[in-house]
Interface confidence: low
Amino acid sequence: FKVATPYSLYVCPEGQNVTLTCRLLGPVDKGHDVTFYKTWYRSSRGEVQTCSERRPIRNLTFQDLHLHHGGHQAANTSHDLAQRHGLESASDHHGNFSITMRNLTLLDSGLYCCLVVEIRHHHSEHRVHGAMELQVQTGKDAPSNCVVYPSSSQDSENITAA
C-alpha cells in the first residue's frame, strides 16, 4: 500500500479552519493480526528526505495525535487534549484520514506529514508517509477561504475549499 496526498498546498486566511487529508491506496490487509497506526506531525523542508524530522503540531506530538485501528475502520481522536488545542484527527472506512485545525494562525504555516504504519503482529511493520504544505496568510492578499492545490494532474489547479 501507499499514501496519497490529494493536495500538496493549502493556502488559508488567518482564523479559518482547515482539514489536511491523506488517503491510503492499494490493497489493505484486513486480517485480524494487522492493525494500522495513523498519525500527523510537522516537519522541516529537508531536501534529502521529506518528513524525516518529527515536530509537534501545536505542542502535540505524533503520539498524541495517533489513530490505532484495523484495516479500513473508522476512527477519530475525540480526547480532550487534542480538542483543547483546536485539533482533531479522523479516519474513515474508505482509507481517507485527516487532521482538522481550527482557528489558524501564522504560526501554523509549514510542512505537515501524515504517517501510516501497518503493524503485523509478531512480524514486521511497513511505514509510509505523505507531505503537504500549509500556508496561513494575512492582509489584503489573503484568500477569503482556504484554497487547495492538487498534488498531481487534475482538472483544476486551485479549488476553493468549502
Epitope: 500538496s8 498546498l9 493556502v11 500556508q135 498534488s151 489547479e157
Partner: antibody, heavy 118, light 112 residues
Framework: QSLEESGGRLVTPGTPLTLTCTVS????????MAWVRQAPGEGLEWIGT??????TYYPTWVKGRFTISKPSSTTVDLRMTSPTTEDTATYFC??????????????WGPGTLVTVSS | DIVMTQTPSSVSAAVGGTVTINCQAS??????LAWYQQKPGQPPKLLIY???DLASGVPSRFSGSGSGKQFTLTISGVQCDDAATYYC??????????????FGGGTEMVVK
C-alpha cells in the same frame, strides 16, 4: 538526479526559440520546475514555474514573451515567442522541492546560452 | 508584486572574518526565504531555506536568520572558497496572481 538544458544558440530578433530541459531520475509529476535566466554580468531573473500538475506561473514582466510546458515525462520546454536583444542570457532550469509554485530550487542544470543579435 | 532588495551589492572580506548580507522584502513573506551561492560559470547552489535551515552538505559557517521582511545571511570564518555572488529568493505563495521577480539583486563577495 540531473537536469540539462539544450537549444541555446544565436538567433536574430523576433525568431522564436524553444529551449528544452531534459531530466534524469526526476518524476515531473511530483516536482515543480522553473526557468531562471542570467544576462552576462547580471543577477538571476525568474522567468516562470510549471507545477507538478502542469499549471504555469510567471512574473508580471513576462507578459506572454515566454511559455513553459511539459511535452513529455522527461522534458520541460521554454518557448521564447519573439526574442529581443535584451533576452541574451544563460538560461537555467531548476527543480523545486515540491510540486507547487512556492518552492526552493534545490537542483539546477548547467545552463544554456542564448544570444539574440542581428 | 513583492520586491526583494539585497544589500550591500558588493562586500570585501578578510579570511577568517565575518560577513553579513541583508535581504529585505517589500511585504511579509514569513520565513519563505532561501539563500544561494553562485560562482562564475556555474549554476546557483542552495545554501539556506526556510530563512535559517542549512541545506545538506553546506558548511555550518553559513547561517541564516530573520522573518517577515528582514533577513540576514551570515558567513563566519570566511574562507577563500567563499568568494562568490550570493542571492536571496522569496518563495512565498500568494493567491494574488501578480508575481514579481523572486530573487534579490545579488551581493558579490571578494575575499582578501
Amino acid at each position: 538526479q540531473s537536469l540539462e538544458e539544450s537549444g541555446g544558440r544565436l538567433v536574430t530578433p523576433g525568431t522564436p526559440l524553444t529551449l528544452t530541459c531534459t531530466v534524469s531520475g526526476i518524476d515531473l509529476s511530483s516536482y515543480a520546475m522553473a526557468w531562471v535566466r542570467q544576462a552576462p554580468g547580471e543577477g538571476l531573473e525568474w522567468i516562470g514555474t510549471i507545477s507538478s500538475s502542469g499549471h504555469t506561473y510567471y512574473p508580471t514582466w513576462v507578459k506572454g514573451r515566454f511559455t513553459i510546458s511539459k511535452p513529455s515525462s522527461t522534458t520541460v520546454d521554454l518557448r521564447m515567442t519573439s526574442p529581443t536583444t535584451e533576452d541574451t542570457a544563460t538560461y537555467f532550469c531548476a527543480r523545486g522541492h515540491y510540486g507547487y509554485f512556492g518552492t526552493v530550487f534545490a537542483l539546477w542544470g548547467p545552463g544554456t546560452l542564448v544570444t539574440v543579435s542581428s | 508584486d513583492i520586491v526583494m532588495t539585497q544589500t550591500p551589492s558588493s562586500v570585501s572580506a578578510a579570511v577568517g572574518g565575518t560577513v553579513t548580507i541583508n535581504c529585505q522584502a517589500s511585504e511579509s513573506i514569513q520565513t519563505y526565504l532561501a539563500w544561494y551561492q553562485q560562482k562564475p560559470g556555474q549554476p546557483p547552489k542552495l545554501l539556506i531555506y526556510d530563512a535559517s535551515d542549512l541545506a545538506s552538505g553546506v558548511p555550518s559557517r553559513f547561517s541564516g536568520s530573520g522573518s517577515g521582511k528582514q533577513f540576514t545571511l551570515t558567513i563566519s570564518g570566511v574562507q577563500c572558497d567563499d568568494a562568490a555572488t550570493y542571492y536571496c529568493q522569496n518563495y512565498y505563495f500568494s493567491t494574488n496572481s501578480n508575481y514579481g521577480d523572486v530573487f534579490g539583486g545579488g551581493t558579490e563577495m571578494v575575499v582578501k
